[in-house]
Interface confidence: low
């Protein structure tokens, strides 16, 4: 359905709210080291463009596509040269070369400072001066530190915000009602755009194929009462919007979504039993609601899956006839009777049948070559099954903050070419599996942990990829999609690398350390156990946990002491030395 | 990098015949459906052709039919489509395109396209 002016079409499907909000976003998240003032006036002159639209679809402009008025106005940044460089670049090319640029210098770790939270009172004295400017505010810091945060669902979590704050300033305690719903928002919100980022990077370096493949696992295992067909409906509609999103195209994006939250609210006698409560609920809510639906019960008389994919004399036709349709039909089959399995392990079942299916219908005798293809499943099957079970049995026995150091000893050991601060946030969140899924029952472990594993892995490729510096990872990333947590799992130590020479700064401690919070303090000792590993590589555990010991006694010791930094300056060169001991 | 080369485009005269060739490389051409589209001078883009992966599923627009013939072979990682009875209509930029689609119900998926070859039918 074409319309005279796009932008008008957009400015009246979504509201001026949302509109506003989403065009806000946009900017954010292509000029990232933008002022706030500067985006809200870029963002109200489109604005009050799309209302001369809405007034008059065939007025001057209104005709252009959404990426020509939006980088046409992104290219009238005065300072864009002197603040992004080459990006400037960009402004040079003709669309849709243009915003390809633009995507392509979406930054994943912009050179911003860390939020800092304000007293309660300050916070609700600017919500209560100024709502909206407080809000625009949220979205803009928000996206322009997460270039891939699901739009839409950015609206979302505002919306929450403006709620705590609405609720929380006219309460008797602020901080003991707000802080907690503040946090909340926070971890939710990164959760959220690491999922994102994992999705844009299966569309943009795999294809929408790969996308579109995990999309029918993954709502295979959510709605498995739903038909074949029904899925495909919806993965179509899914990849479409998510496309959108992680090409920038935000005011598409959001309008599909509602659709997509439409249509299956109509049509939920034909998908799940579970969508009833979240179609009640306003648009926002509703669709953030619906992705996170839990799965469905699966339908009791499920035939055996054999009967179609190894029994059957027609495999090989089925195949042949429709390649694609027959192992989506498979991946499917299989996902709605396995809600127990990760969905990349799904996906790696479906790839291994696929290569089963070309070798054997090549062959002599078919159905004799492929009449075993479930049994080589059960290795495949087995190898996250053991991992989550021998992970989760180490968390149990550390605890966290334990937990994550074996991690980071074990990642550190694998790349120690990665930069420390990378090894430090990517194992301190592989850390965080154990909190988020032991202790759920053994049949959601599984999609849980490895499912998060490669949300967490994405992370650590996308940083990677800005700076290349070791050729492991850069494997393990662009190889395979599905195969990238087992390939980082298989991963030993680096034989070839060259341990890094000893630097007695990285282990000079002051007094400040005492002052910081305790997850600040984790960091710390975590960077230097980082530098322990990536000095002496080869060090054993038993080494390293001397070391780990000896530096907490000596900071506790020290913070303890009347005069702080005195100690540290005269205690600190001993730890370091006794640790260079302890690892020689 | 996914390279898709359109060639066997000319000038020829109504009535006669021309055999368009696809050379596709960068990718596994046996795992894609692939398509003919074309642009007629001052015109969209027209949907010409389609054919699955191995050739079993083969379809064609309505104003080419019995005309236009699509194949493949995917040991040569090769795309053609032979055009029978020409008519100035047929005057056009033709493009081959790969399809990404996952399920071959439902639309296709149009993700790489080659440069064009062009075909002019005229006396």
């Known amino acids: 359905d074409t319309h005279k002016s796009e932008v008008a079409h957009r400015f009246k499907d979504l509201g001026e709210e949302h509109f506003k909000g989403l065009v806000l976003v946009a900017f954010s998240q292509y000029l990232q080291q933008c002022p706030f003032e500067e985006h809200v006036k870029l963002v109200n002159e489109v604005t009050e463009f799309a209302k001369t639209c809405v007034a008059d679809e065939s007025a001057e402009n209104c005709d252009k596509s959404l990426h020509t008025l939006f980088g046409d106005k992104l290219c009238t940044v005065a300072t864009l040269r002197e603040t992004y460089g080459e990006m400037a670049d960009c402004c040079a090319k003709q669309e849709p070369e243009r915003n390809e640029c633009f995507l392509q210098h979406k930054d994943d770790n912009p050179n911003l400072p860390p939020l800092v939270r304000p007293e309660v009172d300050v916070m609700c004295t600017a919500f209560h001066d100024n709502e909206a400017t407080f809000l625009k505010k949220y979205l803009y810091e928000v996206a322009r530190r997460h270039p891939y945060f699901y739009a839409p669902e950015l609206l979302f979590f505002a919306a929450r915000y403006k709620a705590a704050f609405a609720e929380c300033c006219q309460a008797a305690d602020k901080a003991a009602c707000l802080l907690p719903k503040l946090d909340e928002l926070r971890d939710e919100g990164k959760a959220s755009s690491a999922k994102q980022r994992l999705k844009c990077a299966s569309l943009q370096k795999f294809g929408d194929r790969a996308f579109k493949a995990w999309a029918v696992a993954r709502l295979s295992q959510k709605f498995p009462k739903a038909e074949f067909a029904e899925v495909s409906k919806l993965v179509t509609d899914l990849t479409k919007v998510h496309t959108e999103c992680c090409h920038g195209d935000l005011l598409e994006c959001a309008d599909d979504r509602a659709d997509l939250a439409k249509y299956m609210c109509e049509n939920q006698d034909s998908i799940s039993s579970k969508l009833k409560e979240c179609c009640d609920k306003p648009l926002l809510e509703k669709s953030h609601c619906l992705a996170e639906v839990e799965n469905d019960e699966m339908p009791a008389d499920l035939p055996s899956l054999a009967a179609d994919y190894v029994e059957s004399k027609d495999v090989c036709k089925n195949y042949a006839e429709a390649k694609d349709v027959f192992l989506g039909m498979f991946l499917y089959e299989y996902a709605r009777r396995h809600p127990d399995y990760s969905v990349m392990l799904l996906l790696r079942l479906a790839k291994a049948y696929e290569a089963t299916l070309e070798k054997c219908c090549a062959a002599a005798d078919p159905h004799e070559c492929y009449a075993k293809v479930f049994d080589e499943f059960q290795p495949l099957v087995e190898e996250p099954q053991n991992l989550v079970k021998q992970n989760c049995e180490l968390f149990e026995q550390l605890g966290e903050y334990k937990f994550q150091n074996a991690l980071l000893v074990r990642y550190t050991k694998k790349v120690p070419q990665v930069s420390t601060p990378t090894l430090v946030e990517v194992s301190r969140n592989l850390g965080k599996v154990g909190a988020k899924c032991c202790k759920l029952p053994e049949a959601k472990r599984m999609p849980c942990a490895e499912d998060y594993l490669s949300v967490v892995l994405n992370r650590l490729c996308v940083l990677h990829e800005k700076t290349p510096v070791s050729e492991k990872v850069t494997k393990c990333c662009t190889e395979s999609l599905v195969n990238r947590r087992p390939c980082f799992s298989a991963l030993e130590l680096d034989e070839a690398y060259v341990p890094k020479a000893f630097n007695a700064e990285t282990f000079t401690f002051h007094a400040d350390m005492c002052t910081l919070s305790e997850k600040e303090k984790q960091v710390k000792k975590q960077t230097a156990l980082v530098e322990l590993v990536k000095h002496k590589p080869k060090a054993t555990k038993e080494q390293l946990k001397g070391v780990m010991d000896n530096f907490a006694a000596f900071v506790e010791k020290c913070c303890k002491a009347d005069d702080k930094e005195a100690c540290f300056a005269e205690e600190g060169p001993k730890f370091v030395a006794a640790s260079q001991a302890a690892l020689a | 990098e996914v390279q898709l080369v359109e060639s066997g485009g000319g000038l020829v005269q109504p009535g006669r015949s021309l055999r368009l060739s696809c050379a596709a490389s960068?990718?596994?051409?046996?795992?894609?459906?692939m398509h003919w589209v074309r642009q007629a001078p001052g015109k969209g883009l027209e949907w010409v052709s389609g054919?699955?992966?191995?050739?079993?599923?083969?379809t064609y627009a309505d104003s080419v039919k019995g005309r236009f013939t699509i194949s493949r072979d995917n040991a040569k990682n090769s795309l053609y489509l032979q055009m029978n009875s020409l008519r100035a209509e047929d005057t056009a930029l033709y493009y081959c395109?790969?399809?990404?689609?996952?399920?071959?119900?439902?639309?296709?998926?149009?993700?790489?396209w080659g440069q064009g070859t062009l075909v002019t039918v005229s006396s």
């Open positions: 395109v790969r399809d990404s689609s996952l399920f071959i119900v439902g639309a296709p998926t149009f993700d790489h």
């Open positions: 054919i699955s992966w191995n050739g079993n599923k083969i």
């Open positions: 960068g990718f596994t051409f046996h795992h894609y459906a």
